[in-house]
């Protein structure tokens, strides 16, 4: 029996329905000149196709506005389409502060992101903002930090903590939820010449979202009274066969080595999982790997202990494990885990298989190991081929949110937003996108207006709408902002 | 090795309150959900709630209005609160420990319990 | 709530025989591709102890002559050749939903 039945209910009021886009590169001009150009021009039609300036006419000019930028533009229209509440970008580091410090700050970048942000908060649309999103091809680094060793080096914890400073100061003023790192969980697949390289540089990644969440509380939480978490990867794990006690170890193992590793120091003991430290030490007494988890000062337990004010997770399949035991010094055999395709199973063009229950058993786990805290399901979609009728992800949406909301009403989980992923395909990558990446929508896009609109999946004569203070309170806090900061 | 030792049991009049503890040795709060079970004299075993790792609880809905179960893990020792006793609450309450996998849902060390008796 | 109900309620069986007890659930206790079902052994004045979970899995230290099956709402525990020691109260017990839920019983003894 793989699941329970569809529940009928809805989320509540306050539910953050939301899509993800990963980093905004940001226009560097607004490209719409023609209003800030003073001189009055004659177009050559059928000659030589060009401009001509009259001499001795000047036109009056109006102020650059944030719809110049064709980008945001292009952005807004989509969003207004998907009726979300809240929208998740992520800033460009390597933009806003090309050589790694305060010494050169590039206030065209901060600009942009800052009309992405105040523009969708006059469609209603609130941005939660990703300070940094590395990819796997490209880290997302100022060079000068990059060619420092990047995140083997411990000072780029305190960089890090400088560029976070400046977006709070800069955006923190509209911006109420801050995400510091997108998976650093994942920066395994980049820091992976070795186990140490790969635990090294998490530690350097856990200390530099401590210090940007210590400088928050301090500096800016009193006034902005926002809230700062970081993204961890979270796919779910099964044992590959469930009667078999090594494969749900194995399971077990993953989500220690997965998802554990960042959320134990930081939402409960300030250290690493102790099953994590005690198997790669276990390891290292056997002549299996030379690796080592870092051993975290007192001073460095106090630093990372408690530093999120919410559980951000990116969930977007299960995976399927077994028991194999690796040798060799890399954090892939460190784990002894080996992942199994059930091709049995639905699965998209990646092979990525749709399991809902999966987001259902990860919440439950959550919130058994770290408490009741509230849950954002920061990114969670699959790759579609299709480019107009994208049933599998209409089907991969209501399933997912179906288990979501078990996980809410049954299992009591403070689940507090979804955001699927994600806004608009890039060229030729997988297709995650509600859009095309010519901009054309898809049949999704109405499908998740449908669960937004009804706050899930209702009763029947159950009434969607939340009561009407409620409204008021967010149209005149966002008409308060834009009023506040055009 | 692990053991969970209970104590504030006696009896206690009819509408009162008890507040047990659990003493756990050699495993931490920290890692492993605790259990409180009840046994009725010559009965069956009754869940009463469990609180997990992290602190969140999960109650029996037939006891929730009367029962609280909390920790402090610089104690190692977990509590059951529960009012407005009655006889029929008159039983042997063990603690016991969860497995400690999210894949396993069972309790594998038991307290030897606690003997309430509620009578006037 | 999901009832566990238990048959027979006692067995007598002789030494290294075979004892089998049935547990039936008023409703699946098997979802998500896992059986949630557990069995225990309560000896007198001890507190019980665990046997099997996940319908069939042995605990640590616990004698291969005790094994698990079923899935569903149908779960059987079947003790191979019974011993002197394992004279005792066997419970089964699920954790699918909550409240988790135990079975009335099933008192073992020798004939």
């Known amino acids: 029996k793989e699941s329970t039945p569809d529940v009928q209910g809805q989320f509540p009021c306050d539910f953050s329905w939301g899509v993800t886009e990963s980093v905004l590169k940001p226009e560097s001009v607004a490209s719409s000149p023609q209003f800030s150009d003073p001189h009055l021009y004659v177009w050559n039609a059928t000659g030589n196709r060009l401009l001509h300036r009259v001499e001795g006419v000047r036109l009056k000019t109006r102020p650059a506005q944030c719809t110049d930028f064709v980008n945001i533009k292009k952005q807004l229209e989509m969003l207004a389409r998907m009726k979300v509440t809240h929208y998740r970008f992520a800033l460009d580091w390597a933009s806003v502060l090309p050589t790694g410090n305060l010494s050169a700050v590039n206030r065209q970048a901060l600009r942009y992101y800052r009309c992405v942000v105040s523009e969708g908060l006059k469609l209603g649309i609130s941005a939660m903002v990703t300070l940094y999103y590395p990819t796997h091809a490209h880290l997302g680094l100022p060079e000068p930090l990059l060619h420092a060793d990047g995140w083997l080096n411990p000072s780029t914890a305190e960089a890090f903590q400088a560029y976070a400073g400046l977006c709070f100061q800069e955006l923190g003023d509209l911006v109420k939820l801050w995400i510091t790192i997108n998976e650093p969980n994942r920066l395994s697949d980049i820091y992976n010449r070795s186990g140490n390289d790969t635990y090294g540089a998490a530690h350097n990644l856990l200390v530099a979202h401590a210090l940007a969440w210590r400088l928050y509380d301090r500096q800016f939480r009193p006034s902005q009274r926002g809230a700062v978490s970081l993204s961890l990867h979270a796919d779910w794990a099964e044992p590959a066969n469930p009667y078999a006690d090594s494969h749900w170890r194995a399971a077990e193992r993953f989500l220690q080595f997965e998802i554990a590793w960042f959320a134990e120091p930081l939402f409960k003991t300030g250290d690493y999982p102790a099953a994590m430290r005690e198997y790669i030490a276990s390891k290292h007494r056997r002549g299996l790997s030379s690796s080592a988890l870092p051993r975290l000062t007192e001073a460095e337990r106090r630093l990372l202990k408690g530093t999120v004010d919410f559980c951000a997770l990116n969930h977007f399949t299960t995976r399927f494990v077994m028991h194999e035991q690796l040798a060799g010094s890399r954090y892939d055999s460190d784990r002894d885990i080996q992942f199994l395709q059930d091709i049995t199973r639905l699965s998209s063009p990646t092979r990525l298989a749709v399991i809902p229950w999966g987001v259902r058993k990860l919440l439950r786990w959550v919130r058994r190991n770290y408490g009741d805290m509230d849950i954002y399901i920061t990114a969670s979609g699959i790759d579609d081929q299709a480019l107009e009728d994208d049933r599998l992800r209409k089907y991969y949406l209501g399933k997912y949110l179906q288990e979501v909301l078990k996980a809410y009403l049954i299992d009591k989980v403070r689940i507090k937003g979804y955001y699927a992923f994600k806004l608009a395909e890039e060229k030729s990558k997988p297709r995650f996108g509600f859009f095309t990446s010519d901009f054309k929508a898809k049949s999704s896009i109405q499908f998740y207006n449908k669960v937004i609109s009804s706050r899930g999946f209702p009763f029947e004569n159950s009434s969607s709408r939340c009561s009407q203070t409620q409204e008021n309170t967010e149209c005149t806090v966002c008409l308060f902002l834009v009023q506040k900061k055009p | 090795e692990v053991q969970l030792v209970e104590s504030g049991g006696g009896l206690v009049q009819p509408g009162g309150s008890l507040r047990l503890s659990c003493a756990a040795s050699d495993f931490s709060l920290t890692t492993y959900g605790v259990h409180w079970v009840r046994q009725a004299p010559g009965k069956g075993l009754e869940w009463l709630g469990v609180?997990?790792?992290?602190?969140?609880?999960d109650y029996n809905a037939a006891f929730i209005s009367r029962l609280t179960i909390s920790k402090d893990n610089s104690k190692n020792t977990v509590y059951l609160q529960m009012n407005s006793l009655r006889a029929e609450d008159t039983a042997v309450y063990y603690c016991?420990?969860?497995?400690?996998?999210?894949?396993?849902?069972?309790?594998?060390?038991w307290g030897q319990g606690t003997l309430v008796t509620v009578s006037s | 709530d999901i009832v566990l109900t238990q048959s027979p309620d006692s067995l007598a069986v002789s030494l290294g025989e075979r004892a089998t007890i049935n547990c039936r659930a008023s409703?699946?206790?098997?979802?998500?591709?896992?059986?949630?079902m557990t069995w225990y052994q309560q000896k007198p004045g001890q507190p019980p102890k665990l046997l099997i979970y996940r319908a069939a899995n042995l605990q640590s230290g616990v004698p291969d002559r005790f094994s698990g099956s079923g899935s569903g709402t149908d779960f059987t525990l079947t003790i191979s050749s019974l011993q002197a020691e394992d004279v005792a109260v066997y419970y089964c017990q699920q954790s699918n939903e909550d409240p988790w839920t135990f079975g009335q019983g099933t008192k073992v003894e020798i004939k």
């Open positions: 409703e699946s206790v098997e979802s998500y591709g896992n059986r949630y």
């Open positions: 016991a420990r969860d497995y400690g996998s999210t894949y396993v849902d069972a309790i594998d060390y």
């Open positions: 609180i997990w790792s992290g602190g969140s609880t």
